[in-house]
Structures are given as C-alpha cells and as structure tokens.
Interface confidence: low
C-alpha cells in the first residue's frame, strides 16, 4: 500500500523535517502550512487546526512562503529625484533607485535618502572615475596632448588629432586644428562615453516589519526550521 499522505497539521516523525512550504511550530509541536507570498499568518496552527492565512493589506507585502503575523511594510514612496523600478505589490517591496545621471549621496537604512546629480566635468577636464550608484564622478585635468571640449559626466580626455600641418595647436579644452590638408590620423573622432552605472539599490536592505511585535524576519527564509532531531533538546 502507498504511504499515507499526512495533512497539516501533523506530528513529524522523530528526526525528520517538515515538508516544503511547511514549518515546525514549537508550541504546537506540529508541522503546519506556511502562507504563500502575498499572505501572512492570521491565526497560528494548533495541534488540531492548521495555519489560517490572510492577504496582505495595501502597502504591505510578503515575498516568500512565511508564517509572519503581519506583512512587511513597503518602503516609502520614491522621492522626486528617484524612479520606482519595482512597484509595491502584495508580493514584493517597492524598489527606488536614483534616476539616470544621479547617484546616492546620502544613504538611509531603508534605502537612499538623498540622490544628487552626477558631477559634470567642464571643458579641459575629463572623467577620471565614472559615477556609480553611490559615488560621484571624479574629474581630472586633461594631460598634455589630450582635451575635452564638453561639459559631461561621461566624457574622458581624448587625444588631439595629429596634423600634417597644425593651424591651431590643441590645448586641454580644444582639439588641434589642422590646415586644409586632412590629418594623418584622428585618434578619436567621436566623444568617448563611459558606461552609466545601473542602480539596483532596494529601499530596504532586508525585509522590515511594520511596527508590530512581528518575529525576526529570519522567519521569511525559504525553508522553515526543522523540528529537533531525536535525542536533541529543542529551543
């Protein structure tokens, strides 16, 4: 005969673990159902009744199978200098990132508190270090033989073109001008653009409980804790 399928709640066999999407309730000493993403535990299981789940309220979420008593609060709405790259739904937190051309100048525990525009290097200066999600552009003066004639957060110093006959010598902010005879070689006819950083910062570094007596967010781990093995002492 095939083995009987146990329905939650059930007492696990000594030394065995609860099945996927179940957790071990130390009070009931039973394997009980977890709630699906977008839900939370409204009533915890007992020896005779399974977990009762309920949908997350507006502006709250659970991303994983869980048994938290309250859904997690979605992060604050994105500020005007940020873009919402992921909306708050019942199953996922809002993600706010600094908009393109900006970086996070002041981080707050729940995400970026203040975005600032990336520095633009003025003519005569080029990008020495590109901006990232959390750091500004670093500019440097163009070295002899190179120039930048733009005000840009991405352009680097480019070599002067090499002329057969120079009409106007180049400087840090201007390319060399050749006489009507064409230059022997143009090192970099177009502006060189550094790749823009792509921000992936989330509002919350970890799921954060709504003000409540919610247990540790470690309860949101994909696999629930197992009951103590035979012969061991439980918590």
């Amino acid at each position: 005969l095939p083995a009987q399928v146990a329905f939650t709640p059930y007492a696990p066999e000594p030394g065995s673990t609860c099945r996927l999407r179940e957790y071990y309730d130390q009070t009931a000493q039973m394997c009980c159902s977890k709630c699906s993403p977008g839900q939370h535990a409204k009533v915890f299981c007992t020896k005779t009744s399974d977990t009762v789940c309920d949908s997350c309220e507006d502006s709250t979420y659970t991303q994983l199978w869980n048994w938290v008593p309250e859904c997690l609060s979605c992060g604050s709405r994105c500020s005007s200098d940020q873009v919402e790259t992921q909306a708050c739904t019942r199953e996922q937190n809002r993600i706010c990132t600094c908009r393109p051309g900006w970086y996070c100048a002041l981080s707050k525990q729940e995400g970026c508190r203040l975005c600032a525009p990336l520095r633009k290097c003025r003519p005569g200066f080029g990008v020495a270090r590109p901006g990232t999600e959390t750091s500004d552009v670093v500019c440097k003066p163009c070295a002899p033989g190179t120039f930048s004639n733009t005000t840009s957060s991405t352009d680097i110093c480019r070599p002067h073109q090499i002329c057969n006959v120079v009409a106007i010598p180049g400087n840090a902010s201007m390319d060399a001008v050749c006489t009507s005879t064409s230059p022997t070689r143009s090192m970099a006819p177009g502006a060189v653009h550094l790749p823009q950083p792509v921000s992936t910062r989330s509002q919350h570094t970890q799921p954060t409980p709504e003000p409540s007596t919610a247990p540790s967010t470690s309860f949101l781990l994909p696999m629930g804790p197992s009951p103590p093995a035979e012969g061991s002492t439980g918590d």
Epitope: S76, K108, Q109, E110, L114, T205, P207, P211
Partner: antibody, heavy 117, light 111 residues
Framework: EVQLVQSGPELKKPGASVKVSCKGS????????MGWVRQAPGQGLEWMGW????????FYADDFKGRFVFSLDTSVSTAYLQISSLKAEDTAVYYC??????????WGQGTLVTVSS | DIQVTQSPSSLSASVGDRVTITCITS??????????LNWYQQKPGKVPKFLIH???NLRSGVPSRFSGSGSGTDFTLTISSLQPEDVATYYC?????????FGQGTKVEIK
C-alpha cells in the same frame, strides 16, 4: 514583543562622561536604525540623531556634534550613547527609539542623566 | 533644517470637546504626494507613544477619536471627543529629512 530596555539613571559631576545603553529585543536588531531623543526637565523632545545598525554609521543633529557619540554592539543587540565633558545643561532623560520608515515606533523607558556638582 | 512650529502651546477643554492642534513646517514635508509628518503622545511621566504616521495614518491600537490631516506645510491633529485619558503633551515631528525635528509640544488638559 518588541522591547527597548535602557540602562538605569546616572548622577555625574560636570566634566565627567556617561554611557547609556539600549538593548533591543523581539525583532532583528540590524533591520532598523536606532535613534536617540533628549528631553530636558519640563521641556520638549529633541532629536539627537540615529545610528545605522548595519554599518555602524552615525548621524548627529547639529546641536549634538562633538561630545555625543553613538555606538553599537550588534552581538548583544545593544546601542550606546556616550556623552563626554558633561555640563549641567546635559541633565535630561535620554530615550533610544527604533527608527522605522513610518516613524519612531518603539521607545526605551528613558535614562535620566543628572549632572550636578 | 526644517523648523516645526506647533500651536497652541497649551489648551484646556472639557470632556467630550473637539480639540484641534496645528503644526506648521518651515518647508514642505511632502514627497511624491506623501506627507512625512508624524504625531506622538506623551502622558505625564510616561514615554512618548507613536500615534499617527504620514500625516493621517493611525497606528494600530490608537482610538479612532484621534485623526490627522494636512499636507505640504500645514497639519492638524484632531481629538473628536476629548477623554480624561487624553491628558498629555502632543508632539508633531517631520520625517522628510535628517535631522528629524519635533514641534515644541502642545499640552492638553481637562477643564
């Protein structure tokens, strides 16, 4: 149950130092920042600043830069406020408070620091 | 820094009265349509208690006679029917940016 438990009252002489502790329980301590608020006798609430419990980076309001230091021991889920070169005007109740995105949602019971010669 | 001003500094009202406290910030505390303005209640000799977040959202467990409204720079806390247990000092606080700043408080007493 979320709880913030602070150390007991302190009586100090001017020029001395004091260190107030705040132990968090009932939640993952490093999930949320910890703020500090001062209330002088008969006065209102003053926000002193906060400390990032993941990085240990403090932020101080202008009036609390210099003699005030926020620190952490995450292994025991505890935040600390140290005040050096105490003055009579530092006499106050100091509260630690959990810095949730919605607001200062849980508060310690407060620690009275009295500075008197 | 954003300055926060409350009025009145104190008031006395009868049980059952409607009580209104105002809070004005020196610049807007709104971001993308959300007002980062919180209200706290501190009863005599007690720890402050978090009442309202984002201008109008009651914290769970707070009696429904409390309500908050406003946006931008002008905010109001209303107690629709004052009860003896509402005797306290009420503080507004802006959470738009660091440093957070509190109003000076409004002391509510029973006549």
């Amino acid at each position: 149950e979320v709880q913030l438990v602070q150390s007991g009252p302190e009586l100090k002489k001017p020029g001395a130092s004091v260190k107030v502790s705040c132990k968090g329980s009932g939640y993952t301590f490093t999930d949320l920042g910890m703020g500090w608020v001062r209330q002088a006798p008969g006065q209102g609430l003053e926000w002193m600043g906060w400390i990032n419990t993941q990085t240990g980076e403090p932020f101080y309001a202008d009036d609390f830069k210099g003699r005030f230091v926020f620190s952490l021991d995450t292994s025991v889920s505890t935040a600390y406020l140290q005040i050096s070169s105490l003055k009579a005007e530092d006499t106050a109740v100091y509260y630690c408070t959990r810095d949730h995105p919605l607001g200062l949602d849980y508060w310690g019971q407060g620690t009275l620091v009295t500075v008197s010669s | 820094d954003i300055q926060v001003t409350q009025s009145p500094s104190s008031l006395s009202a009868s049980v059952g009265d409607r009580v209104t406290i105002t809070c004005i910030t020196s610049q807007s505390v709104d971001v993308a349509g959300v007002s980062y303005l919180n209200w706290y209640q501190q009863k005599p000799g007690k720890v402050p208690k978090f009442l309202i977040h984002k201008a109008s959202n009651l914290r769970s467990g707070v009696p429904s006679r409390f309500s908050g409204s406003g946006s931008g720079t002008d905010f109001t806390l209303t107690i629709s029917s004052l009860q003896p247990e509402d005797v306290a000092t009420y503080y507004c606080q802006q959470a738009r940016e660091d440093p957070y700043t509190f109003g000076q408080g409004t002391k509510v007493e029973i006549k």
